[in-house]
Amino acid sequence: TALSPTPTTMTFTPAPLEETTTRPEFCKWPCECPQSPPRCPLGVSLITDGCECCKICAQQLGDNCTEAAICDPHRGLYCDYSGDRPRYAIGVCAQVVGVGCVLDGVRYTNGESFQPNCRYNCTCIDGTVGCTPLCLSPRPPRLWCRQPRHVRVPGQCCEQWVCDDDARRPRQTALLDTRAFAASGAVEQRYENCIAYTSPWSPCSTTCGLGISTRISNVNARCWPEQESRLCNLRPCDVDIQLHIKAGKKCLAVYQPEEATNFTLAGCVSTRTYRPKYCGVCTDNRCCIPYKSKTISVDFQCPEGPGFSRQVLWINACFCNLSCRNPNDIFADLESYPDFEEIAN
């Protein structure tokens, strides 16, 4: 009906029993599209179908999906076919979030909090482990301590700072003098005994075209790990970047279009033009990924309504190497914490 978030409600008739293992064809070639694109309800993206043919309203959380009727990629949805074994033809749109985590061979469910040791409290969120240190002793008081030492206190998990470089001062832990530390204005940003932590951005969900990248951050009022997302486009799908590789070279690290263009998202257009850099390709086994990038806010204006803004990955530079591993490893950034090896091993 025209009233549900998917205006053209798709009704899927199951195949007869003897045919349950054959996959129905949802795509027709050549493409057969209605004359005009459909109108999508507020909040629903107008996207190209999975056949790369027609404009459709993206299926939403809980909607049925097929290879043609695809789930809303701008909302981090994917088609879960697990309920349609063995055909895997008709799925249900589910959140990419909600995936469990594995750390050191131990599986944790989504949302589960655990302590890999006495120094860290970790939470599994959407396949990523975010950890906050439990040892919250501040840095040594900079007002007077020139040679601080981090010492292990017998019977205690967390180390303490001691300061014994100044004879005029008794030996004591910095915890006893946090007022001097606070007066220096050097206190870390804290939310009631909480160290602000933000994981690196996950890899883009697509290797070309518009995708989604996520990260975990506890920089919020509750100090609770929450997921943030941004749009990303590592390289355009419709450009053969190999054609731009210079003679005698095997890679093009960065591809940048000649013209500045507008970003488009769900039928809406960015209010200004951009000339983004994309990561290139190699003719050998190497892969090119961003190594200098930032997040920018892009304002979009829609043809039939006010606009909105989205966080977008902005690539400054890429490099090409043989290490094509999944860089979705938040522990790479945890190494700056003391005794990281205790939770990494």
Epitope: S4, P7, Q35, S36, R39, P41, L42, C302, F308
Partner: antibody, heavy 117, light 112 residues
Framework: QVQLVESGGGVVQPGRSLRLSCGAS????????MHWVRQAPGKGLEWVTV????????YYADSVKGRFTISRDNSKNTLYLQMNSLRVDDTAVYFC??????????WGQGTLVTVSS | DVVMTQSPLSLPVTIGQPASISCRSS???????????LNWFQQRPGQSPRRLIY???NRDSGVPDRFSGSGSGTDFTLKISRVEAEDVGVYYC?????????FGQGTKLEIK
Amino acid sequence: QVQLVESGGGVVQPGRSLRLSCGASGFTFSRFAMHWVRQAPGKGLEWVTVTSFDGSEIYYADSVKGRFTISRDNSKNTLYLQMNSLRVDDTAVYFCARDALGSIDYWGQGTLVTVSS
Amino acid sequence: DVVMTQSPLSLPVTIGQPASISCRSSQGLVYSDGNTYLNWFQQRPGQSPRRLIYKVSNRDSGVPDRFSGSGSGTDFTLKISRVEAEDVGVYYCMQGTHWPYTFGQGTKLEIK
């Protein structure tokens, strides 16, 4: 059958706040965009605000922008309108209504908000 | 915003006679999907609005067939073939093509 029931109206002084609620039943609330439309005494209908099915997209009329906030709780099948810095010209019957893709197909009975000193 | 202008604002009609209400929009109402999202609502005294017509000419279920909608572009019309006593009230046109949705000022239909 579709039912929309508004509540929370009343008499309030200028500058004060009020929160309206709209309970929905008879349809899958979480699949529909929802509107607030108001009608000043003896006047015509004025569209106020809309929220998408999941609350991710929200639009306001210029007359209420920055003062009114629409929100929804899909687990409770309830639509809200938080009205701050109320003015005398906000006096109206406030209707909660269901979006129908370029239209509005169902309306509540309305709740009267009177802003008076 | 799209301005919707109705005429007449007051319409006295004899029972059994036809009635016609005009609605004009300040810009075209054809959406990119090819549809024109022009609606008509009836509001009886002391009641909530009720939708009669959507997408210019589609009648809602339960709406008597004496009500019909027509028009295109920027000019639209609601016709009542034979007015009955229960038709008394205010009639509004509303466009749903552009955000924000906007209403006409209303036409008050009364019995002569």
